[in-house]
Amino acid sequence: APVRSLNCTLRDSQQKSLVMSGPYELKALHLQGQDMEQQVVFSMSFVQGEESNDKIPVALGLKEKNLYLSCVLKDDKPTLQLESVDPKNYPKKKMEKRFVFNKIEINNKLEFESAQFPNWYISTSQAENMPVFLGGTKGGQDITDFTMQFVSS
């Protein structure tokens, strides 16, 4: 069965956009004008996950690329990575847990909590041009709030 999905871009609460940094990393920086075309377009898929009142399980793929954000342990630390997948099998309704994020929406701001590692969130740094990462703190220096912009399919 087809997975329900939509195309979107994400900006952090400081209005930094997300762009590719090499083949398997995203970074966050302020973009303007024509440079906005550099920002990555996500295909957000609505997948199976644990029932919760305020959390919607999603997978975040890069549109028209066989890459998905995933959460794995590296050196015993939860880490965000871009993982290559077989396009014949993805996206799917029952995504492996490492690909699943709980989308939490509060006042039109979004947080993306790792389903694999509860209380770890997709995060950006205050500083410009730094990698997007999985952070274990909310409300501190690092940014965990995003806004979503719909993109025409």
Partner: antibody, heavy 120, light 107 residues
Framework: QVQLVQSGAEVKKPGASVKVSCKVS????????IEWVRQAPGKGLEWIGE????????NYNEKFKGKATITADTSTDTAYMELSSLRSEDTAVYYC?????????????WGQGTLVTVSS | DIQMTQSPSSLSASVGDRVTITCKAS??????LSWFQQKPGKAPKSLIY???RLVDGVPSRFSGSASGTDYTLTISSLQPEDFATYYC?????????FGQGTKLEIK
Amino acid sequence: QVQLVQSGAEVKKPGASVKVSCKVSGYTFSRYWIEWVRQAPGKGLEWIGEILPGNVNINYNEKFKGKATITADTSTDTAYMELSSLRSEDTAVYYCSTIYYDYDQGFTYWGQGTLVTVSS
Amino acid sequence: DIQMTQSPSSLSASVGDRVTITCKASQDIDRYLSWFQQKPGKAPKSLIYRVKRLVDGVPSRFSGSASGTDYTLTISSLQPEDFATYYCLQYDEFPYTFGQGTKLEIK
């Protein structure tokens, strides 16, 4: 408050087309899917398809592919469903409804319905 | 397509009665299940979504529950305005499918 106002009743001849509109107000148009549902006289409800206006994403019930065309105009916050090659069995009330973009809230709001009668 | 088998197709009850209507899904629908009320000549009205969450403004006498692929709408104490036709809907997989309806009549 949220309102979905549909166009008025239509009487069409077999083979003709009809375009039903659904004008929404009271919420951000681009953040809600517009659903289209039909109900033949004395019958149950049948899902036709959906559109996410801000994304131009459209999903159809295979049964209605080639019969229904769903579009949306974000400048007027209006969704449309055009039915082609009408036959008597297309006589029904057609409803629009809404569901939040992430599907979490169900088909919360409904239009009043548009009766399409196909008769020679 | 996912089949939603709704039962009973009709039901006679009295004001104050407790009634239950059931929908059985032909496969897992991940709790994407809504219930609607429809009165003659009117649009459906949303009552419950995601199995058990009440739509704003819907009286608390309406409740929903699930057991496996069986989904239940319960009206704890029927009021005169509750006599109508009720439909379930699965919106987990395309095409979304409705139950065939349960007509709730006054005994």
